[in-house]
């Protein structure tokens, strides 16, 4: 239709509950159903500032067709004011919700079962390990490779040789640290990989194995004996 119209709320009933008190680890959904012509866009602010994916562990989902913001496994740091801003060229409207996260007892980090999962790839291939962490307190996450020195996996003290491959730093988002990418895999990359998550209560870790197979084209070349060569 050609009737140009500034944004307007289409379902104010769904917006009446402004204060949301949610137990930690639960999922929160805020909705701002709206209309307008042209169809307005929606963005979200947290405490008056642009809300970015890296602002929370696990990020968040925006369902534009449902005019909603979804945060899974909320933690105390998610507390605050969330404002939806709906706008088009004819106007802008906004609505603010307040989220209070009811703390459970803080616990050592929980890593999602089955992750990281064992993986296999051919030489030259790419592989990724995924680690999903839930923690009341902001966790510190590391990816560790169990390595060998002088043909041994363990030092004279009986402790394993380890190499930190990736750790959360100033320029690393939680989203980025949850995935370990290994590009152009070699046979040396085979072995045990550990995702470690720690917080003020303790440390948890899960491990997975990477198996590296010969590249298909090179298999004959590596395994065939001279007797079979034409």
């Amino acid at each position: 239709s050609n009737n140009k119209r500034a944004p307007y709320w289409t379902n104010t009933e769904k917006m009446e509950k402004r204060l949301h008190a949610v137990p930690a680890a639960n999922t929160v959904k805020f909705r701002c159903p709206a209309g307008g012509n042209p169809m307005p866009t929606m963005r979200w602010l947290k405490n008056g500032k642009e809300f970015k994916q890296e602002h929370r562990i696990g990020g968040y989902k925006v369902r534009n067709q449902h005019w909603s913001l979804i945060m899974e496994s909320v933690v105390p740091s998610d507390k605050g004011n969330y404002t939806c801003v709906v706008e088009n060229e004819y106007g802008s409207i906004n609505h603010t919700y307040h989220l209070d996260v009811v703390e459970r007892s803080p616990h050592r980090p929980i890593l999602q079962a089955g992750l990281p999962a064992n993986a296999s790839t051919v030489v030259g291939g790419d592989v990724e390990f995924v680690c999903k962490v839930y923690s009341d307190a902001q966790p510190h996450i590391q990816w560790i490779k169990h390595v060998e020195k002088n043909g041994s996996k363990y030092g004279p003290d009986g402790l394993p040789y380890l190499k930190v491959l990736k750790a959360a730093g100033v320029n690393t988002t939680d989203k980025e640290i949850e995935v370990l990418y290994i590009r152009n895999v070699t046979f040396e990359d085979a072995g045990e990989y550990t995702c470690l998550a720690g917080n003020s209560i303790g440390i948890s870790f899960h491990s997975a194995w990477l198996t590296v197979l010969p590249a298909p084209g090179r298999e004959k070349e590596i395994t065939a004996s001279p007797d079979y060569l034409e």
Partner: antibody
Framework: EVQLVESGGGVVQPGRSLRLSCAAS????????MHWVRQAPGKGLEWVAV????????YYADSVKGRFTISRDNSKNTLYLQMNSLRAEDTAIYYC?????????????????WGQGTMVTVSS | DIVMTQTPLSLSVTPGQPASISCTSS???????????VYWYVQKSGQPPQLLIY???NRFSGVPDRFSGSGSRTDFTLKISRVEAEDVGVYYC?????????FGGGTKVEIK
């Protein structure tokens, strides 16, 4: 040698304040969470508070929440416990305990190293 | 809060004989990483607690092999295979899975 040494204990009247310190040596203090645990005379052990390695997260036992504050100065390798509005039931030996480190551990991830403790007596 | 209940309250043992202390938690201490976060300590007179066993059954460095830990989920046991005079003290179990960290009430071990 890994060591924790508490200080600052003493006799104090109810309602008054006291600040305990714990000096750490022999390990990278800034890489470990730290705890306070107390023990009333002739009684068992009671966890008091924990602070993360960088001081960003703090948790308290309900019995001290709002009265005690745990803090740390990584540049001085020192842990603190600020105790306000002290009560007779806060009378105890206060132990500083090393918590979980930041990296992979073979062995316990904390609660392995305890200080000798400092005695706090709250009495009028 | 997780409640740790220890039995018996006290134990009088003949040197060379075995001793056993039980500890029950009000919730499972088996974590998603497969470890069971129960720790055992001994506190000798005038000293801070000393770690004996961590993560259910692992002996801490320097702890004699006469000490062993076992159990699953909510029921745990500390065993001393042959008690020696130096083992006198109060033994505590502790859960290390969530805050507030909680301890058992203690078991006083004496020598007959």
């Amino acid at each position: 040698e890994v060591q924790l040494v508490e200080s600052g204990g003493g006799v104090v009247q109810p309602g008054r304040s006291l600040r305990l310190s714990c000096a750490a040596s022999g390990f990278t203090f800034s890489s470990y969470a730290m705890h306070w645990v107390r023990q009333a005379p002739g009684k068992g052990l009671e966890w008091v508070a924990v602070i993360s390695y960088d001081g960003s997260n703090k948790y308290y036992a309900d019995s001290v929440k709002g009265r005690f504050t745990i803090s740390r100065d990584n540049s001085k390798n020192t842990l603190y416990l600020q105790m306000n509005s002290l009560r007779a039931e806060d009378t105890a030996i206060y132990y500083c305990v090393r918590g979980a480190g930041r990296g992979y551990t073979y062995g316990p991830d904390g609660f392995d190293i305890w200080g000798q403790g400092t005695m706090v007596t709250v009495s009028s | 809060d997780i409640v740790m209940t220890q039995t018996p309250l006290s134990l009088s043992v003949t040197p060379g004989q075995p001793a056993s202390i039980s500890c029950t938690s009000s919730r499972s201490l088996l974590h998603s990483d497969g470890k069971t976060y129960v720790y055992w300590y001994v506190q000798k007179s005038g000293q801070p607690p000393q770690l004996l066993i961590y993560e259910l059954s692992n002996r801490f460095s320097g702890v004699p092999d006469r000490f062993s830990g076992s159990g699953s989920r909510t029921d745990f046991t500390l065993k001393i295979s042959r008690v020696e005079a130096e083992d006198v003290g109060v033994y505590y179990c502790m859960q290390y899975i969530e805050a507030p960290l909680t301890f058992g009430g203690g078991t006083k071990v004496e020598i007959k």
